[in-house]
Interface confidence: low
């Protein structure tokens, strides 16, 4: 358990005196005294504290600016931020998201392994052994080659990790 | 109205121990602390430590950390500080008085001798 | 420790006078506080956070200073302010008092 504190939860100590913090959503004004309670007031429009505090300003409300790629994904309320995240297409930078930028392609042998979202990249991988990718796509996966057998064709042209395998007619003079 | 009342005065001889009491009226008594302020004959003023009733944390003057422990009732609404090993310098008044020292007890005299 | 030292030691003046009494800080402190003390009787919060008038004081009693210089000062004697007076600080552990200043009737 926590050892025990000179003063109580949500109080805290200045001048030998155990005062209130303010509640979320207010700043503080100017502290208690043996006579005067703890003053506090409430953040002013697009500010914000989001904890009990001994603040002497509130916090701006986080911009989400267009030019970085930016939208707001939840607005701030007096107790906390703005939330912003990444335009269609784009994704944040950074966990706090500051800036955003393009989704990657997965280029031609390289398939979407997970498509991308507002905070993460595009994750590409590898085409293996059967499959190919032969565009630069931010959200297509590779795909199988052709299985020239079900459909009663033979291989003309092998696969690659960028190309599908060419399948032709059966030679029948060799059956 | 606020009040603190403390225990009479006592006669000591030098070794013993002696409690002192101090029980607070007119307020909430966790919500500040007590302290405990010693004034030795014709003197000034020295503190000695508090305790914060809400649960029980105590901060002591070094000076007095072997001296005193201070200790508090939330049952009755009282504090405490038992004084041990007195000596002859431990004669005193002895005062609670609560955070901020807008109250004091009246004080109590502490006569440590053989 | 932060020591208080006050001076005057004595101050003698006579009912009607204005009284200065000080009180300096070995090292910076963030408020002082004052009290009177009367034979027999234990101390009174006259002034705390350096300029707040306690509950009950009359307005004659004011103080003032920051850092590591106080002063408390009574704008006209009464003849009931002959007494002692202690000021004291809170800022930091152990909370100490200065030695006291002791206010006659000259």
């Known amino acids: 358990p926590e050892p025990p504190t000179a003063c109580r939860e949500k109080q805290y100590l200045i001048n030998s005196q155990c005062c209130s913090l303010c509640q979320p959503g207010q700043k503080l004004v100017s502290d208690c005294t043996e006579f005067t309670e703890t003053e506090c007031l409430p953040c002013g429009e697009s500010e914000f504290l989001d904890t009990w505090n001994r603040e002497t300003h509130c916090h701006q409300h986080k911009y989400c600016d267009p030019n970085l790629g930016l939208r707001v994904q939840q607005k701030g309320t007096s107790e906390t931020d703005t939330i912003c995240t990444c335009e269609e297409g784009w994704h944040c930078t950074s966990e706090a998201c500051e800036s955003c930028v393009l989704h990657r392609s997965c280029s031609p042998g390289f398939g979407v392994k997970q498509i991308a979202t507002g905070v993460s990249d595009t994750i590409c991988e590898p085409c293996p052994v059967g499959f190919f990718s032969n565009v630069s796509s931010a959200f297509e996966k590779c795909h199988p080659w052709t299985s020239c057998e079900t459909k009663d064709l033979v291989v003309q042209q092998a696969g690659t990790n960028k190309t599908d395998v060419v399948c032709g007619p059966q030679d029948r003079l060799r059956a | 109205q606020v009040q603190l009342v403390q225990s009479g005065a006592e006669v000591k001889k030098p070794g013993s121990s002696v409690k002192v009491s101090c029980k607070a009226s007119?307020?909430?008594?966790?919500?500040?602390?007590m302290h405990w302020v010693r004034q030795a004959p014709g003197q000034g003023l020295e503190w000695i430590g508090y305790?914060?009733?809400?649960?029980?944390?105590?901060k002591y003057n070094q000076k007095f950390k072997d001296k005193a422990t201070i200790t508090a009732d939330e049952s009755t609404n009282t504090a405490y500080m038992e004084l041990s090993s007195l000596r002859s310098e431990d004669t005193a008044v002895y005062y609670c008085?609560?955070?901020?020292?807008?109250?004091w007890g009246q004080g109590t005299l502490v006569t440590v001798s053989s | 420790e932060i020591v208080l030292t006050q001076s005057p030691a004595t101050l003698s003046l006579s009912p009607g006078e204005r009284a200065t009494l000080s009180c300096s800080a070995s090292?910076?402190?963030?408020?002082m506080h004052w009290y009177q003390q009367k034979p027999g009787q234990a101390p009174r919060l006259l002034i705390y956070?350096?300029?707040k008038l306690a509950s009950g004081i009359p307005a004659r009693f004011s103080g003032s200073g920051s850092g590591t210089d106080f002063t408390l000062t009574i704008s006209s004697l009464e003849p009931e302010d002959f007494a002692v007076y202690y000021c004291?600080?809170?800022?930091?552990?152990?909370?100490?008092f200065g030695q006291g200043t002791k206010l006659e009737i000259k």
């Open positions: 008085a609560r955070q901020g020292f807008p109250y």
């Open positions: 007119g307020y909430t008594f966790t919500n500040y602390w």
């Open positions: 305790i914060n009733p809400s649960n029980d944390y105590t």
């Open positions: 090292s910076s402190v963030s408020y």
């Open positions: 956070d350096t300029s």
């Open positions: 004291h600080q809170l800022s930091s552990d152990p909370f100490t």
